[in-house]
């Protein structure tokens, strides 16, 4: 007769092993016991479990309670054993040794071999803001048995780098997303993608990139100059920017303070009808945490009586 | 036949020793595991210590470990059992028994008892 | 340690009766129990051990039986030579331990 069992039994954290031990033996053979030791290099066999003919399961007192015999039916020639919710510590050798008459002794080794999943955890970088070098966007980080595989799923231009530390039992790796932040960036999903055997599918974390920026301001309103003229209603100048965060507006006449009646709502500002005194230099001024900007314009709102149009500057500052 | 004889029983003082031998004959006792049970006066049975055959294992009862110790001379057919610290509660027939040999090479289980010795006894008194 | 329990502790029965004796393990002990007899000044004596297996040289009224935790002796036509004192055994664990006994006395 021989025995059958495996060369390496795998199994996930948590779950119950099988650890295979069958006889095939001749016609007339019988099995008297099956005794299960655990039997890593370098320490004495440390008995599991003893499936005897007669007596039965006998489970020693370090694994009482988690060493059971498959359900039924039963080969009386099976020496298989389940451990029941593998933990880490489970991972090594274990020995089958089963007697049987009239063929005598057989023992077979196996390994078992515990898998851990990660539990990924993805921290965003320092805040991200346009103009800045290559900078941190953020970094992943998953401990498991064996080492997972850290990769990143993104759209984003970057670089990745990635280094592991090695535990007793489990491997942590951690990998870094660097870019030079744009504004372009704003929104984009950057996933952490994490790898393992004892994963049924990829774990996937995504962050969101927020990369502080404030476009230049301009002013819109003033295209055509001959609309200002005294009488007119419904005039308006809109400041144009964008930025994140989203910036507020702030609007400040610079040759003294706002005509009565014109009216600021956020980056409109909206005039009653039109008269000379409208007439002056308006400055947007835009902000955000980030940075702010300014730009100006010159209103010179025309009298019809006159004949010749007056000239509009458009100045933009920063 | 399997006979097993036990001897150095006697009256020995509180804190006193003692030594029992066991002598086996009729098997071959160094395949054997072997254990010692012992029976207070009027009462039931108590296992005291046993020695595995496999690597000399040895194990006691908590009432005598530390006091006891169990030992065998394969090449005398021998069975031994040193009693040390002795008290008053340790007054009892001592029987040496053979262990029945269907479970091989494991030592967290022991097997029953199928032959046993007549006995030998042991009083602690002053 | 594993407590056995034995009851009754001692019976009164008369030669051709049957005779129950139970044993119950504290915890479970699947098959690996004994059965011994005592009969006064001697040594205990094997009767049944793996719960139901006959030893040797046993007479057949002697049976056994149970898994577990809960264990019978069964003598099924009780001879004058029955008379004595029966005790279980477990042997799953070190120390190994002993039923208090049952007494079988002539009625």
């Known amino acids: 007769g021989e025995l059958e069992t495996s060369d390496v039994v795998t199994v996930v954290l948590g779950q119950d092993a099988k650890l295979p031990c069958f006889y095939r033996g001749d016609s007339g053979e019988q099995v008297g016991q099956v005794a299960w030791a655990r039997v890593d290099a370098g320490e004495g066999a440390q008995e599991l479990a003893l499936l005897h003919s007669k007596y039965g399961l006998h489970v020693s007192p370090a694994y009482e309670g988690r060493v059971e015999q498959p359900p039924p039916p039963r080969n009386p020639l099976d020496g298989s054993v389940l451990l029941r919710n593998a933990v880490q510590a489970d991972e090594g050798e274990y020995e089958c040794r089963v007697s049987t008459f009239p063929a005598g002794s057989f023992q077979a080794r196996l390994r078992l071999r515990v898998l851990v999943p990660p539990l990924p955890s993805l921290n965003p970088g320092p805040a991200l803001e346009e103009g800045q070098g290559l900078t941190l966007a953020a970094s992943c980080t998953a401990e498991g048995s064996p080492a997972p595989s850290v990769t990143w799923d993104t759209e984003v231009k970057g670089t990745t780098s990635s280094r592991s530390f090695k535990h007793s039992r489990s491997a942590a790796v951690t990998s870094e997303f660097h870019l030079v932040p744009s504004r372009s960036m704003n929104g984009q999903p950057l996933t952490c993608v994490v790898s393992h055997p004892g994963l049924l599918q990829d774990q996937r974390i995504t962050h969101i990139l927020h990369v502080s920026f404030l476009a230049e301001a301009s002013v819109r309103g003033l295209e055509d100059q001959n609309l200002w003229h005294i009488g007119r209603e419904g005039a308006m100048l809109k400041c144009l920017s964008e930025g994140q965060p989203p910036p507020s507006y702030n609007w400040t006449r610079l040759d003294g303070p706002l005509p009565s009646g014109v009216r600021v709502d956020g980056d409109t500002l909206g005039f009653p009808p039109l008269t000379t005194e409208h007439s002056g230099i308006y400055v947007c001024h835009v902000s955000n945490e980030f940075s702010s900007r300014d730009s100006q314009v010159t209103v010179d709102v025309l009298d019809p009586q006159e004949d010749s149009g007056k000239q509009v500057d458009l100045v933009s500052a920063s | 036949e399997v006979q097993l004889v036990e001897s150095g029983g006697g009256l020995v003082q509180p804190g006193g020793s003692l030594r029992l031998s066991c002598a086996a004959s009729?098997?071959?006792?160094?395949?054997?595991?072997m254990s010692w049970v012992r029976q207070a006066p009027g009462k039931g049975l108590e296992w005291v210590s046993g020695?595995?055959?496999?690597?000399?294992?040895?194990s006691y009862a908590d009432s005598v470990k530390g006091r006891f110790t169990i030992s065998r001379d394969n090449s005398k057919n021998t069975l031994y059992l040193q009693m040390n610290s002795l008290r008053a509660e340790d007054t009892a027939v001592y029987y040496c028994?053979?262990?029945?040999?269907?479970?091989?090479?494991?030592?967290?289980?022991?097997?029953?008892?199928?032959?046993w010795g007549q006995g030998t006894l042991v009083t602690v008194s002053s | 340690d594993i407590q056995m329990t034995q009851s009754p502790s001692s019976l009164s029965a008369s030669v051709g009766d049957r005779v129950t004796i139970t044993c119950r393990a504290s915890?479970?002990?699947?098959?690996?129990l004994a059965w011994y007899q005592q009969k006064p000044g001697k040594a205990p004596k094997l009767l049944i051990y793996?719960?139901?297996s006959l030893q040797s040289g046993v007479p057949s009224r002697f049976s056994g039986s149970g898994s577990g935790t809960d264990f019978t002796l069964t003598i099924s036509s009780l001879q004058p030579e029955d008379f004595a004192t029966y005790y279980c055994?477990?042997?799953?664990?070190?120390?190994?331990?002993f039923g208090q006994g049952t007494k079988v006395e002539i009625k």
């Open positions: 028994a053979r262990e029945y040999s269907d479970v091989v090479d494991y030592v967290s289980v022991r097997t029953p008892l199928d032959y």
């Open positions: 009729g098997y071959s006792f160094d395949t054997y595991d």
């Open positions: 020695i595995k055959q496999y690597k000399g294992y040895t």
């Open positions: 915890q479970g002990i699947s098959s690996y």
């Open positions: 793996a719960a139901s």
């Open positions: 055994q477990q042997h799953y664990t070190t120390p190994p331990t």
